[in-house]
């Protein structure tokens, strides 16, 4: 799990004998006197390969901790296997020329040696206790202390490959990943949303006069909402195509129904390529050599803590953050409709929350196991999550679906905006998730526009 | 095949500055993009990233206020402005390209440029 692997010169030889061990006829092409379609297609029974030389000969494997020293010299005769030297290892049956090298644990990633390589099994690498693995690529790790929430509480514990999530108390704001007094907060920062419940309390017991003006501002308010509600109604068709090409850069929203497949594609895998940073004389420790690292498959929760904040027309951006992320995959980051638009002729209130498309794409992008605390802090009940839960049986995303709509329905349309669910987001300490939000609705950057998703 | 290059990194004296470029090649250079550090002997060190569109940028405290990225799209490159460079600055610094939907994992990196300040 997350282990180094074998130098980057080894590699391609490594990798061209693991074939050979474990997938003997698709190698055939490889064996210079083995030529026709007949020959590549013979192939032999499990645990034995295909002599080199002759392929009307089946070798039997080496046993894991041996390598091949010899091929048999004809059938039913036995195959001429050594045992690794100390330092290699062969962890299943094969026909390798060599033993692979054994791993080092990463010092300077922090991590240690949990068992010692052996001729049939490698080094196995992890993390001291208290502490989480950042992973930086599928097989690169480095090893961080848990965060111990601190004028907060747990709110999912630490885990092998995840931080300690953390909900603050109240007078304290989340940054990176930690409690922050919110006597920290700057006026620039994003924190300030955060804080500001508190600080306008402060002033509300100060002054007895707000007691008798609040309820009546807030009366004569929600009067004018509800006229505006109405007006708003009739123009709401030519609105929310307006709005769709503000937000998405396209001229006429197309049909619903597209949903699916609209987020970015990863890139392939560079096959060649070696998963094991190498060391270089001069500089030093190089993550990657070539080209790629494949990504885990598992989704971790916290995979878009506040990664990549809004940039805010006048004041700097606030990076809440840890440099190596609060995630299992050490992991995070698009642009969102929450930010003031940095083009200032485009300034879009929200994204169409009553389209499916839009819902789905929070339904994607939230870390599952933060949805709870996501839909909570929307203000549904533990009654009422539970019981859609139960309406929708086994399927989830149906489930949390559910759960938007109903948030939706209740909130009045002006509220109801993708704006709400960002600050949500923010309080969260996910905002990387709402540019994921949007990248999925309006598509990456370079490309043309995803199918539309918004009616 | 996709390539990442870093270029710009060099000797610097403290208080000074360097631009970074990292030029993109063979894949279309629509993700989240970032730039990550290792000093000499250490673990690596989550730098700056920017969103595909490069509307949101985010940044590590340690670097906060003196770096900015920031991309060109139209010519597949990535950028780190570096101003007032401290001595704990030096590292060799990488470009990668996130993972869709993982955070601040990265699984394309160039082979890393190194900065000096000294």
């Known amino acids: 799990m997350g282990l180094s692997t074998v130098p980057d010169l080894l590699l391609p030889l490594v990798l061209l004998e693991l074939l050979v061990g474990i997938y003997p006829s698709g190698v055939i092409g490889l064996v210079p006197h083995l030529g026709d379609r007949e020959k590549r297609d013979s192939v032999c029974p499990q645990g034995k390969y295909i002599h080199p030389q002759n392929n009307s000969i089946c070798c039997t494997k080496c046993h894991k901790g041996t390598y091949l020293y010899n091929d048999c010299p004809g059938p039913g005769q036995d195959t001429d296997c050594r045992e690794c030297e100390s330092g290699s290892f062969t962890a299943s049956e094969n026909h390798l020329r060599h033993c692979l090298s054994c791993s080092k644990c990463r010092k300077e990633m922090g991590q240690v040696e949990i068992s010692s390589c052996t001729v049939d099994r490698d080094t196995v690498c992890g993390c001291r206790k208290n502490q989480y693995r950042h992973y930086w690529s599928e097989n690169l790790f480095q090893c961080f202390n848990c965060s111990l929430c601190l004028n907060g509480t747990v709110h999912l514990s630490c885990q092998e490959k995840q931080n300690t999530v953390c909900t603050c108390h109240a007078g304290f704001f989340l940054r990176e990943n930690e409690c922050v007094s919110c006597s920290n907060c700057k006026k620039s920062l994003e924190c300030t949303k955060l804080c500001l419940p508190q600080i306008e309390n402060v002033k509300g017991t100060e002054d007895s006069g707000t007691t008798v003006l609040l309820p009546l501002v807030i009366f004569f308010g929600l009067c004018l909402l509800s006229l505006l509600f109405i007006g708003l109604m009739y123009r709401y068709q030519r609105w929310k195509s307006k709005l769709y090409s503000i937000v998405c850069g396209k001229s006429t929203p197309e049909k619903e129904g597209e949903l699916e497949g609209t987020t970015t594609k990863p890139l392939a895998p560079n096959p060649s390529f070696s998963p094991t940073p190498g060391f270089t004389p001069t500089l030093g420790f190089s993550p990657v050599p070539s080209s790629t690292f494949t990504s885990s498959s598992t989704y971790t929760p916290g995979d878009c803590p506040n990664f990549a904040a809004p940039r805010r027309e006048v004041a700097p951006p606030y990076q809440g953050a840890d440099p190596i992320l609060a995630t299992a995959l050490a992991s995070d980051p698009i642009p969102n409709p929450l930010q003031k638009w940095e083009d200032s002729a485009h300034k879009p209130q929200s994204l169409d929350t009553d389209d499916p498309a839009t819902l789905y794409a929070v339904v994607e992008n939230v870390p599952p196991l933060r949805w709870k605390e996501f839909v909570r802090r929307l203000g549904l009940s533990d009654h009422e999550i539970d019981r859609l839960e139960l309406q929708n049986g086994r399927c989830l995303r149906e489930a949390q679906y559910s759960m938007l709509a109903t948030w939706r329905r209740r909130t009045p349309r002006r509220e109801a905006t993708l704006e709400l669910l960002g600050r949500v987001l923010r309080d969260m300490d996910l905002l990387g998730c709402l540019e994921d939000i949007e990248e999925a609705l309006c598509g990456p950057a370079a490309l043309p526009p995803a199918p539309s998703l918004l009616r | 095949e996709v390539q990442l290059l870093e270029s710009g990194g060099g000797l610097v004296q403290p208080g000074g500055s360097l631009r970074l470029s990292c030029a993109a090649s063979?894949?279309?250079?629509?993700?989240?993009m970032g730039w990550v550090r290792q000093a000499p002997g250490k673990g690596l060190e989550w730098v700056s990233s920017?969103?595909?569109?490069?509307?949101?940028?985010s940044y590590a405290d340690s670097v906060k206020g003196r770096f900015t990225i920031s991309r060109d799209n139209s010519k597949n490159t990535l950028y780190l402005q570096m101003n007032s460079l401290r001595a704990e600055d030096t590292a060799v610094y990488y470009c990668?390209?996130?993972?869709?939907?993982?955070?601040?994992?990265?699984?394309?990196w160039g082979q890393g440029t190194l900065v000096t300040v000294s």
């Open positions: 063979g894949f279309t250079f629509s993700y989240r």
């Open positions: 920017i969103s595909s569109r490069g509307r949101h940028t």
């Open positions: 990668a390209k996130r993972v869709p939907g993982r955070g601040r994992s990265f699984d394309y």
